[in-house]
């Protein structure tokens, strides 16, 4: 298992919400990506292929997510101060072998300017 800080901008703020970007190498074809808040699984997305190369996308913990060819984005809405925490992208690579797990993360700072529906 590889642990480290994300070497890219992991948090993108917009409209009182945040897009959390979890990247994976282009070569990875089948994987599970989990978003952890501290040690708690908030979201997950699994991409696999069957014996005829049919792709299946599965989410056990439902979050609004977006898949591209080298990243999974998870979206959190209605930010408040309780969202401030360490967030980790926990990537399990099934294909290509060998099976590997990598963990990258960063701290989500919440500032007043990023909060939704501020009271004036």
């Amino acid at each position: 298992e590889i642990n480290g800080s994300a070497n890219y901008e992991m948090f993108i703020f917009h409209n009182g919400g945040v897009q959390i970007l979890c990247k994976y190498p282009d070569i990875v074809q089948q994987f599970k990506m989990q978003l952890l808040k501290g040690g708690q699984i908030l979201c997950d997305l699994t991409k696999t292929k069957g014996s005829g190369n049919t792709v299946s996308i599965k989410s056990l913990k439902f979050c609004h997510s977006q898949l591209s060819n080298n990243s999974v984005s998870f979206f959190l809405y209605n930010l408040d101060h309780s969202h401030a925490n360490y967030y980790f992208c926990n990537l399990s690579i099934f294909d290509p072998p060998p099976f590997k797990v990598t963990l990258t993360g960063g701290y989500l700072h919440i500032y007043e300017s990023q909060l939704c529906c501020q009271l004036k």
Partner: antibody, heavy 117, light 111 residues
Framework: EVQLVESGGGLVKPGGSLKLSCAAS????????MDWVRQAPGKGLEWVGN????????NFAPSVKGRFTISRDNAKNTLYLQMNSVKSEDTATYYC??????????WGQGTLVTVSS | DIVMTQSPSSLAVSAGDKVTINCKSS??????????LIWYQQKTGQAPKLLIF???TRHTGVPDRFIGSGSGTDFTLTITSFQTEDLGDYYC?????????FGPGTKLEIK
């Protein structure tokens, strides 16, 4: 240890129905696509069909499409093959197999289905 | 559908022989740098066992005398020094598209 155990095979008349089961253990069943593969006596291997983790995607070989259905019960760790309108050419040993992301890495011992009047 | 062919259909061999089994696909199995080609061994009365995936990667526990090679449409399984426990049928299979199909098999028999 991964184990797949098929059951439900036997003698069935042409046009009849039969339901095969495959009990899985030793791994997280819901994490894997599962397949059925058959082998006629003295012949080679023929893919029958597959099902994704939660049964949302099911594919069949042209030779069985419209006659066979595949389902799974993740709570019971069991895979099923419902065979309807069977023909003599469906006579075979039926194997359930785990698709381990890039190959069939585990197979059951097989169950023999004989279609004869 | 992709058609898989194998040659020879059967082969008589002796212990220590180098054995070569060929597999050909009706279209290229190469995608994103990987060949979607698998080899299985099946002994009499048993279920098939995985030997090689992605054309050349040995499955866990498979002896290193089994070597997979080839790319595109032409593939080879080589047993560098045949052992009597290697008797049985050998099948190639593609998983490039649906339906995944198997070759007709190659039977290895004792000379």
């Amino acid at each position: 240890e991964v184990q797949l155990v098929e059951s439900g095979g036997g003698l069935v008349k042409p046009g009849g129905s039969l339901k095969l089961s495959c009990a899985a253990s030793g791994f997280t069943f819901s994490d894997y696509w599962m397949d059925w593969v058959r082998q006629a006596p003295g012949k080679g291997l023929e893919w029958v069909g597959n099902i994704d983790h939660d049964g949302n995607i099911i594919n069949f070989a042209p030779s069985v499409k419209g006659r066979f259905t595949i389902s799974r019960d993740n709570a019971k760790n069991t895979l099923y093959l419902q065979m309807n309108s069977v023909k003599s050419e469906d006579t075979a040993t039926y194997y359930c197999a785990r698709w381990g992301h890039y190959a069939f890495d585990s197979w059951g011992q097989g169950t023999l289905v004989t279609v004869s009047s | 559908d992709i058609v898989m062919t194998q040659s020879p259909s059967s082969l008589a061999v002796s212990a220590g022989d180098k054995v070569t089994i060929n597999c050909k696909s009706s279209q290229s199995l190469l995608s994103s740098g990987y060949n979607y080609l698998i080899w299985y061994q099946q002994k009499t009365g048993q279920a098939p066992k995985l030997l090689i995936f992605y054309a050349s990667t040995r499955h866990t526990g498979v002896p290193d005398r089994f070597i997979g090679s080839g790319s595109g449409t032409d593939f080879t399984l080589t047993i560098t020094s045949f052992q009597t426990e290697d008797l049985g049928d050998y099948y190639c299979q593609h998983h490039y598209s649906s339906p995944p199909t198997f070759g007709p098999g190659t039977k290895l028999e004792i000379k």
